[in-house]
């Protein structure tokens, strides 16, 4: 029943062009190129995409034409390597072009930059955007794909097509509205926030595949799909996992045409077989392709079947446990994970994976014994502390969030994480701690049964951002250790870190705490980031500062900004009051 077993095609590029259609083909090639060559100007990419598209059309007309039999990696890699400024713009990435496939593609993948040195995207005035949209809709939408793809080199390409479709719909509707801004801006904000979340979620999938291997990704997928489709048989879930793994392996590997094509096939298969998968798919399956795939990926968990038997019978009490384990270890562990996950939509995926790992470790030890059952009889008791740890952590942090509100909760996390890993760059600490803090408003509103899957799986996504950013410029052994030892134990590893006693406090630099009148014109969010940046720097200067000391300094700082932003001569106020504030803060913190 494999969805993806196709006849061999004489021309892969023709095959994908025909399957996807010209519009999607061009969009996906543009995304692929922008994700590889993140610094290239838009016009250069459009030119390359047009050349590839024209070539693909010749292959559609005659699959035996010259070069049409070449692999997509060969065709795309050859095209990328024609860029004249490759050496000047990308430095050693140009060396990739001296390699043969598949090494050349691997080389390009290794040079993808999670934090490219690109200017922040500034949103023009609504009228300016609407004019650009009306003047050349195609270019406007291509520009969107290009700008997102180059800043998010692991963005899930078929999902980016869905975002672009919504982006287009927003402009089509709102540029005709009476109040264009009121219509458009909330939609753009929503797309931006959803886009960042989507990018981060996909980045974790790619990290899982690339750093921990296919087995790790498949385990994650078994757990998640079993929670989502608890009525589906194990064989059905296994088939979906195999196909989903292929889709994500392709996208994470830069094979975006194959990925999009296979994702469409998977959506088709799921909808054709929804009776044996989930009762919640009906609405999704009535939608057009891009919406359908997105909807399936986000679909709510189906109801659990009634009267599921106890897990202990097959996995603890049965005399055949070790026999079944020996016969097919991964299948047996997969069945354990499936059975546990479908019964526990209230657990995070990472918790389910920790339980499965504990079960595996126990079987490895106990099945070597003369009396295995005596050894593993109490294995489920070992699960209790593993379940209670995230439950308690979430309870404590939700209480703190409810007490402080999002901004102050983020500040508490900023202090906590700066003390744990003070070597990490300030922008990274601010970005990651702000995102960690968003778990409060995202998850604490949920009832108990939904809190853990929401919170802990979200934290896994955010901590992966820390891991990929840190990997680019490693500065902390503790971060490296937590990021590389175990994918499912990253969060507990970071939670367990105490204050880094080996850290030598940063030298005090008054310039870091010098502010100007421009802070008054910033949005509330930007102003918060400025203040949080100062907070991280304070902790780096004085890691032993108490909560009370830091709170006092931050309150003074907030009052100082408010006062100077109301002053007639703002700049003079910032200069004079700023000096006083720095002096007072130094005294308060004993700097």
């Amino acid at each position: 029943r494999g969805v993806f077993r196709r006849d061999a095609h004489k021309s892969e590029v023709a095959h994908r062009f025909k399957d996807l259609g010209e519009e999607n083909f061009k969009a996906l090639v543009l995304i692929a190129f922008a994700q590889y060559l993140q610094q290239c100007p838009f016009e250069d990419h459009v030119k390359l995409v047009n050349e590839v598209t024209e070539f693909a059309k010749t292959c559609v007309a005659d699959e035996s034409a010259e070069n049409c039999d070449k692999s997509l990696h060969t065709l795309f890699g050859d095209k990328l390597c024609t860029v004249a400024t490759l050496r000047e713009t990308y430095g050693e990435m140009a060396d990739c072009c001296a390699k043969q496939e598949p090494e050349r593609n691997e080389c390009f993948l290794q040079h993808k930059d999670d934090n490219p040195n690109l200017p922040r995207l500034v949103r023009p005035e609504v009228d300016v955007m609407c004019t650009a949209f009306h003047d050349n809709e195609e270019t406007f939408l291509k520009k969107y794909l290009y700008e997102i793809a180059r800043r998010h080199p692991y963005f899930y390409a078929p999902e980016l097509l869905f975002f672009a479709k919504r982006y287009k719909a927003a402009f089509t509707e709102c540029c005709q509205a009476a109040d264009k801004a009121a219509c458009l801006l909330p939609k753009l904000d929503e797309l931006r926030d959803e886009g960042k979340a989507s990018s981060a979620k996909q980045r974790l999938k790619c990290a899982s595949l690339q750093k921990f291997g296919e087995r790790a990704f498949k385990a994650w997928a078994v757990a998640r799909l079993s929670q989502r489709f608890p009525k589906a048989e194990f064989a059905e879930v296994s088939k979906l996992v195999t196909d989903l793994t292929k889709v994500h392996t392709e996208c994470c590997h830069g094979d975006l045409l194959e990925c999009a094509d296979d994702r469409a096939d998977l959506a088709k298969y799921i909808c054709e077989n929804q009776d044996s998968i989930s009762s919640k798919l009906k609405e999704c399956c009535e939608k057009p392709l891009l919406e359908k795939s997105h909807c399936i990926a986000e679909v709510e968990n189906d109801e659990m079947p009634a009267d599921l038997p106890s897990l202990a019978a097959d996995f603890v009490e049965s005399k055949d446990v070790c026999k079944n384990y020996a016969e097919a270890k991964d299948v047996f562990l997969g069945m354990f994970l499936y059975e546990y996950a479908r019964r526990h939509p209230d657990y995070s995926v990472v918790l389910l994976l920790r339980l499965a790992k504990t079960y595996e470790t126990t079987l490895e030890k106990c099945c070597a014994a003369a009396d295995p059952h005596e050894c593993y009889a109490k294995v489920f008791d070992e699960f209790k502390p593993l379940v209670e740890e995230p439950q308690n952590l979430i309870k404590q942090n939700c209480e703190l969030f409810e007490q402080l509100g999002e901004y102050k909760f983020q500040n508490a996390l900023l202090v906590r994480y700066t003390k744990k890993v003070p070597q990490v760059s300030t922008p990274t600490l601010v970005e990651v701690s702000r995102n960690l803090g968003k778990v409060g408003s995202k998850c604490c509103k949920h009832p108990e049964a939904k809190r853990m899957p929401c919170a802990e799986d979200y934290l896994s996504v955010v901590l992966n951002q820390l891991c990929v950013l840190h990997e680019k410029t490693p500065v902390s052994d503790r971060v490296t250790k937590c990021c590389t030892e175990s994918l499912v134990n990253r969060r507990p590893c970071f939670s367990a870190l105490e204050v880094d006693e080996t850290y030598v406090p940063k030298e005090f630099n008054a310039e870091t705490f010098t502010f100007h009148a421009d802070i008054c014109t910033l949005s509330e969010k930007e102003r918060q980031i400025k203040k949080q940046t100062a907070l991280v720097e304070l902790v780096k200067h004085k890691p032993k500062a108490t909560k009370e000391q830091l709170k006092a300094v931050m309150d003074d700082f907030a009052a100082f900004v408010e006062k100077c932003c109301k002053a007639d001569d703002k700049e003079t106020c910032f200069a004079e009051e700023g000096k006083k504030l720095v002096a007072a803060s130094q005294a308060a913190l004993g700097l």
Partner: nanobody, 115 residues
Framework: QVQLVESGGGLVQPGGSLRLSCAAS????????MSWVRQAPGKGPEWVSA????????RYSDSVKGRFAISRDNAKKTLYLQMNSLKPEDTAAYYC????????GSQGTQVTVSS
């Protein structure tokens, strides 16, 4: 594909001896405890003896304690059962299993104790 192939059974007089072997393949033999199980005609399976993966810990049912000795050679992926002082009530099909399973995954080898 897990395969367990027993051999060494036969007809023996009461008080006699036999050595059964079980050749294993298709799994990491040296990582698993193993058992011998027997099934007499018309009866359910009966666990006889077990050994841990390293061969250091052996267990026996009361009915064979002091007469049977289980052992293994991990290099050869083979399990053994040395049966001494055999009695008519030891007559059964003997098969080896992984862990303490009593599920029959092989043909087994027939042991008949009769004068």
């Amino acid at each position: 594909q897990v395969q367990l192939v027993e051999s060494g059974g036969g007809l023996v007089q009461p008080g006699g001896s036999l050595r059964l072997s079980c050749a294993a393949s298709g799994f990491t033999f040296g990582s698993f405890g193993m058992s011998w199980v027997r099934q007499a005609p018309g009866k359910g399976p009966e666990w006889v003896s077990a050994i841990d993966s390293g061969g250091g810990d052996t267990r026996y049912s009361d009915s064979v304690k002091g007469r049977f000795a289980i052992s293994r050679d991990n290099a050869k992926k083979t399990l053994y059962l040395q049966m001494n002082s055999l009695k008519p009530e030891d007559t059964a099909a003997y098969y080896c299993t992984i862990g303490r399973s009593t599920s029959r995954g092989s043909q087994g080898t027939q042991v008949t104790v009769s004068s």
